[in-house]
Amino acid sequence: QPEQKASNLIGTYRHVDRATGQVLTCDKCPAGTYVSEHCTNTSLRVCSSCPVGTFTRHENGIEKCHDCSQPCPWPMIEKLPCAALTDRECTCPPGMFQSNATCAPHTVCPVGWGVRKKGTETEDVRCKQCARGTFSDVPSSVMKCKAYTDCLSQNLVVIKPGTKETDNVCGTLPSFSSSTSPSPGTAIFPRPEHMETHEVPSSTYVPKGMNSTESNSSASVRPKVLSSIQEGTVPDNTSSARGKEDVNKTLPNLQVVNHQQGPHHRHILKLLPSMEATGGEKSSTPIKGPKRGHPRQNLHKHFDINEH
C-alpha cells in the first residue's frame, strides 16, 4: 500500500518540481520502499513497497528500488534472501570459503600438521607443523595438534616415542635384576626433530580461471610455492593433475601450500537454498549457522544523493 504519513524522525531530500522549477524539501521514504510520487506544495510524497526482486536498505528519496543481486550460484547458499529491506547475500557451505565469488574447500592439514587458525566462510584454514610434544595422526581441516600421552602420569614409560605424526606408545618395562640395565634402545624422550616448529599459513586458493588474464586455452599449471613468505611447506603428495591454480597476483602475501587440491578448487553452494535452486537440504549433521554481517562487495554502487 502506498504510504503518505511522515514520521517525525524521517530525513528529507531535495526535489525539483518539474512543473514549477521550484526546489522542494520532501520527507524521505522508509527503507523497503521508494518514492512513487514526489511531494508538491500541496501534497506529501507517496511511498510504495519495493517490488519483488528489489530492495532499499535505508530511508531514501529514490524513484526506483535497487535490483537484488543474482541468485546464488550453486553450490553457494543464500545467507540473506532478497527482500524489500535486504539484498541477497551468498556464502559458502560449511567446509568451504569464498574466494572471488566462488567457493573453495578449506585446506586439509596433513598428518603431522594441525590447524593453527580455523577456516571461516571467507578465509581458508591455516595449518602449522606440530610442535615438540604434540602430534596429528589424521588429515583434518578442523583438528589441532594433540599433546602426547603422558606415560609417566599413568605409571608407565614411553616404549616408543611420539613423532609429529604419532603419539607416544606407553608400556611397562620388564622388571630388571640388579645385574641388568634397560636396553640402550629404550627411548623416553621425544626425537630431536621435534625441536623445531614450522608454521604454514594454508593456501589461499583462487579458483581456476579467476584471473582475467587467463587465456581460454590454458591448461592447468601447478602453482608455485611462495617460499619467501612461509617458513615450512606441506609436502605435495597428490596424484591429481589439478592444483591450486591462478593465485591472484593482486592479493599480496598469498601463502600457497601445494597439497592435494584438485579441480574442486573450483567450487561453490546454498544456507537457505535460493529461490532459483531446488533440492538443497541441510543434513542432520550439526553445523553452526553462518555469522551475520558477512562482508561482501556491494554490487549496488548507486549512492543516489537522495538515499541515506
Epitope: Q70, W74, A101, R242, L269, P273, K282, L299
Partner: antibody
Framework: EVQLLESGGGLVQPGGSLRLSCAAS????????MNWVRQAPGKGLEWVSS????????FYADSVKGRFTISRDNSKNTLYLQMNSLRAEDTAVYYC?????????WGQGTTVTVSS | DIQMTQSPDSLAVSLGERATINCKSS????????????LAWYQQKPGQPPKLLIY???TRESGVPDRFSGSGSGTDFTLTISSLQAEDVAVYYC?????????FGGGTKVEIK
Amino acid sequence: EVQLLESGGGLVQPGGSLRLSCAASGFTFSMYIMNWVRQAPGKGLEWVSSIVSSGGWTFYADSVKGRFTISRDNSKNTLYLQMNSLRAEDTAVYYCARGHYGMDVWGQGTTVTVSS
Amino acid sequence: DIQMTQSPDSLAVSLGERATINCKSSRSVLYSSNNKNYLAWYQQKPGQPPKLLIYWASTRESGVPDRFSGSGSGTDFTLTISSLQAEDVAVYYCQQYYSTPLTFGGGTKVEIK
C-alpha cells in the same frame, strides 16, 4: 592415481532398496563436493544428487527426492547413495563423480536394474 | 529448472574438418559477480564414463587437446573441435552448474563422414 570405484548395483524388484558405494583414492576426498549422476540405457546423463565436502548440505533431483539419500564418510573416503522405493525408471548406470565446477573425475559406473 | 538444449542431435564431419556443437540454456548461467559462465562440456565414448573437456564455458581441462575449445556467454554456447580426429568420435554433452537441479543437454553424437 585419482580413482573412484562404484559398487552395490544389481537387480532389484520395484519397491526394493539398494545402497551404492563409491570408494575414492588418490586425492583428499574430504575436500571435494561429490555427485551421483545416472544414465539410463541408450539415454543421456541425468544428475541425481550432490553432497558438500563437510556432508552438511545435500542436493537432490526432484525425481529422487524423498526416496534417495546421499551421504559420505570422509574417514573411509567413501560416498554412498541409499536408494529406496525403487522404480523401473531408476534403471541406469550410476556414476559417482567429483567436483562442481565441472565434474572432473568419474568412476566406471555400477548398473542398477529395477525389474519384476 | 534450467533447461539445456543441444543442437544438432548428430553430426558427421570429415577427418581434419571443423565440428561445431551448440548448447542453449533456458536462463542465463552467467554470474555477474565473477563474470563466469557456469557451463561445462563433456565427451563420452561408448562403454566409458564421461570425460570433462571444458569448464567455465571456455577453460580447457588439463590434458585436453587444444583442438577442443569452448565459447559463448549467457545462454548461448559452442564447443568447437577445430580438426576432427578419429578418436573424437563420441557423444558430447553440455551441463550447467549455476543452479540445482544440475542439468545436461541431450547430447550430440559426432561421427566421421
